[in-house]
């Protein structure tokens, strides 16, 4: 008789990452009988929701339902109908919503209420929407990349599953850059974590991890740009801001009210004699870098050493995976190769920022001008943050791996979040590996 396929014994999970600039929906899949194995969960779909982040819907909450429809319908298609009711859905909102909550807790609650109402209308097992903490965002990002890299597995492999894997059980640090915050998370080497707020203790698969993490609110790439503009306009002699972080010939009008809308610019707020100003790009990497450094207060440190703004940072240790906007920006700039030194990256950024705006627009005709115009700033910001903010050096730069996906799953906090909420990371090493599921009989 012919071999007959058995129904796959698999499970699914959905996580929505409600970031400051956009929302993405991720669908994960795993063999049901291997839930506690490391590395068995993988991403089968990513759906990017059209439109801005959910915090931008504060004055139009009635539009949230439509906004989420396409990606939720996509989830309905991808996941077999028979499994809809048992598929958990989690929504985690990050720094964009943390900032909205700082402005108005009531408005943030309203947005989340409407999100919850909308997501409850689907046939899945909706588990609620919440604003995750910066500490969680860092921790779950660290769990994700190390889970996908097989760092929690006790089995030693003779092969590498990814090109930059350092074939040992030393965990990777995690560097995450969003639009409104950035996270740094790693296991320091025999170092006391001097600040309790930055210390996490995990027991995963029978091993203890003492992890350092910090989330810098307002230091995501978009909010850092707003900060820089608010700082620089303070000393502008008129309503023209000659900005080294934009290409020569680039011009853009900015409303002062938009500049001061975010809590991130409050420290630079002042009464200006104009309602609008014009950014005029001059495209100078070095000057841009200097301007960005002024956002990092390094004059005060109550610990043995700090990153910036008085935040404890232990000495860097081991390899790091840099993902989210670290990866997207560096990928666009063609700087993600393992072989590109920090000096070469700096040189390429100098050349890129100096290119005239008209030339840039022609070279990258398919890229939205809003995004295209900010790559000079974003690339310079990434270098400034990693080198001066986190104290990477030309040597330790070689230990930074710009990662988009690991084995088909996006690097980011969502997988770690789901693994935790579905109790799929055991504290102890599972005693025995269950028999793998046979597809054919």
């Amino acid at each position: 008789t012919q071999n007959k396929a058995l129904p796959e014994n698999v499970k699914y999970g959905i996580v929505l990452d409600a970031g400051s600039s956009h929302t993405s929906l991720y669908i994960y899949k795993w063999p049901a009988e291997k839930e506690n194995d490391t590395g068995v969960v993988h991403q089968v779909e990513e759906c990017r929701v059209k439109g801005p982040g959910i915090s931008k819907f504060v004055q139009k909450v009635n539009e949230i339902g439509i906004y989420l429809t396409d990606c939720m319908e996509r989830a309905r298609e991808v996941i077999p109908r028979s499994q809809h009711q048992e598929t958990p859905v989690y929504l985690g909102a990050t720094a964009g919503m943390r900032l909205l909550r700082m402005e108005s807790e009531e408005l943030a609650d309203r947005v989340l209420d409407v999100v919850e109402t909308s997501l409850s209308n689907y046939p899945f097992d909706f588990q609620g929407a919440r604003i995750i903490t910066g500490q969680e965002e860092g921790a779950y990002g660290w769990i994700t990349i190390n889970y996908l890299l097989g760092k929690f597995s006790q089995k030693t492999r003779w092969f590498s599953i990814v090109p930059y894997e350092t074939n040992n059980q030393e965990t990777f640090g995690a560097l995450d850059l969003g639009g409104a915050s950035t996270q740094v998370t790693f296991v320091p080497q025999n170092q006391t974590i001097e600040s309790p707020d930055n210390a996490l203790q995990f027991r995963l698969y029978g091993k203890d991890y003492n992890v350092y993490t910090h989330s810098f609110l307002c230091y995501g790439k978009d909010q850092a740009l707003w900060q820089k503009l608010a700082k620089d306009i303070q000393v502008a002699s008129n309503e023209i801001l000659r900005d080294p972080c934009f290409h020569p010939g680039y011009k853009k009008v900015v409303n002062v009210s938009d500049l001061y809308k975010t809590p991130c610019t409050k420290r630079f707020e002042m009464t200006l004699p104009f309602q609008q100003f014009e950014i005029q790009g001059i495209g100078n990497y070095q000057q841009c870098h200097q301007s960005i450094l002024e956002l990092f207060n390094t004059s005060y440190c109550p610990y043995s050493q700090c990153a910036f703004n008085g935040i404890f940072l232990p000495p860097l240790q081991g390899d790091f995976g840099a993902f989210s906007a670290f990866y997207f920006v560096m990928k666009f700039l063609n700087l993600t190769s393992e072989k590109v030194s920090q000096e070469k990256v700096t040189e390429m950024m100098k050349k890129f920022c100096a290119q005239p705006w008209e030339e840039i627009k022609t070279s990258y005709a398919g890229v939205k001008e809003k995004y295209l115009s900010e790559y000079c700033f974003s690339g310079t910001y990434i270098l400034s943050l990693l080198l001066q903010g986190y104290h990477f050096t030309a040597d330790s730069w070689e230990h930074i791996h710009f990662i988009g996906k690991i084995q088909g799953s996006d690097a980011g906090w969502t997988l770690g979040y789901m693994l935790n909420l579905t109790n799929m990371i055991p504290a102890e090493q599972p005693l025995s590996t269950p028999l793998s599921h046979s597809t054919y009989v």
């Epitope: 909550r101 807790e105 609650d109 989340l112 209420d113 919850e116 109402t117 409850s120 609620g128 929407a129 919440r130 604003i131 903490t133």
Partner: antibody, heavy 121, light 107 residues
Framework: QVQLVQSGAEVKKPGASVKVSCKAS????????MHWVRQAPGQGLEWMGR????????WYAQKFQGRVTMTRDTSTSTVYMELSSLRSEDTAVYYC??????????????WGQGTLVTVSS | EIVLTQSPGTLSLSPGERATLSCRAS???????LAWYQQKPGQAPRLLIY???NRHTGIPDRFSGSGSGTDFTLTISRLEPEDFAVYYC????????FGGGTKVEIK
């Protein structure tokens, strides 16, 4: 819209227990903490404690520790407050009030209509 | 625990007048953790102000809150007939505590 509907008035004897319910609707039940506040006749407001409906964790005011138990039933979106060893000074209107989302601040946004508990021999 | 003392106990005013209610804490309270409630006879309290100065949804702009540290104030700029009620301040530090209340009555 958000509604908190409490159970009806109760008359109890000293030493007995009372269990007051508060049924929530119009929002995701697990997302907001629920608090209990009481008000003796002609007196001010007194906070008794709170419950996180998502995980069932509780936090009680010191005065009521050992005498109060707050529970929830997620299937019916209902929270309960049980007060034991009742005495005459427990005669009061008992209110449930919706608190914060995780990470928010502790103010009481929406209140139930109140349940009068009378303790009398 | 933090004790909140409200004064005056009773405030006798006419409609159209300005009411200023005080709430003093026994130790410093973060502004984000102070709220004001209004309660009318036979009704549940309702939230007016949170975070010391933020008006809750639907609360008229004649109600305003201010203050920091240990001294907080609720101001009703022009009393309307429906504003005559008891007002409570509330803080959160480790536990919630309420002030004793201020009754605003018609003169």
């Amino acid at each position: 819209q958000v509604q908190l509907v409490q159970s009806g008035a109760e008359v109890k004897k000293p030493g007995a227990s009372v269990k007051v319910s508060c049924k929530a609707s119009g929002y995701t039940f697990k997302s907001y903490e629920m608090h209990w506040v009481r008000q003796a006749p002609g007196q001010g407001l007194e906070w008794m404690g709170r419950i996180n409906p998502s995980v069932g964790s509780t936090w009680y005011a010191q005065k009521f520790q050992g005498r109060v138990t707050m529970t929830r039933d997620t299937s019916t979106s209902t929270v309960y407050m049980e007060l034991s060893s009742l005495r005459s000074e427990d005669t009061a209107v008992y209110y449930c009030a919706r608190g914060k989302r995780e990470g928010g601040t502790e103010y009481l946004r929406k209140w139930g209509q109140g349940t009068l508990v009378t303790v009398s021999s | 625990e933090i004790v909140l003392t409200q004064s005056p106990g009773t405030l006798s005013l006419s409609p159209g007048e300005r009411a200023t209610l005080s709430c003093r804490a026994s130790q410093s309270v973060a502004s984000s953790y102070l709220a004001w409630y209004q309660q009318k006879p036979g009704q549940a309290p309702r939230l007016l102000i949170y975070g010391a100065s933020n008006r809750h949804t639907g609360i008229p702009d004649r109600f305003s809150g201010s203050g920091s540290g240990t001294d907080f104030t609720l101001t009703i700029s022009r009393l309307e007939p429906e504003d005559f009620a008891v007002y409570y301040c509330q803080q959160y530090h480790n536990a919630i505590t309420f002030g004793g209340g201020t009754k605003v009555e018609i003169k």
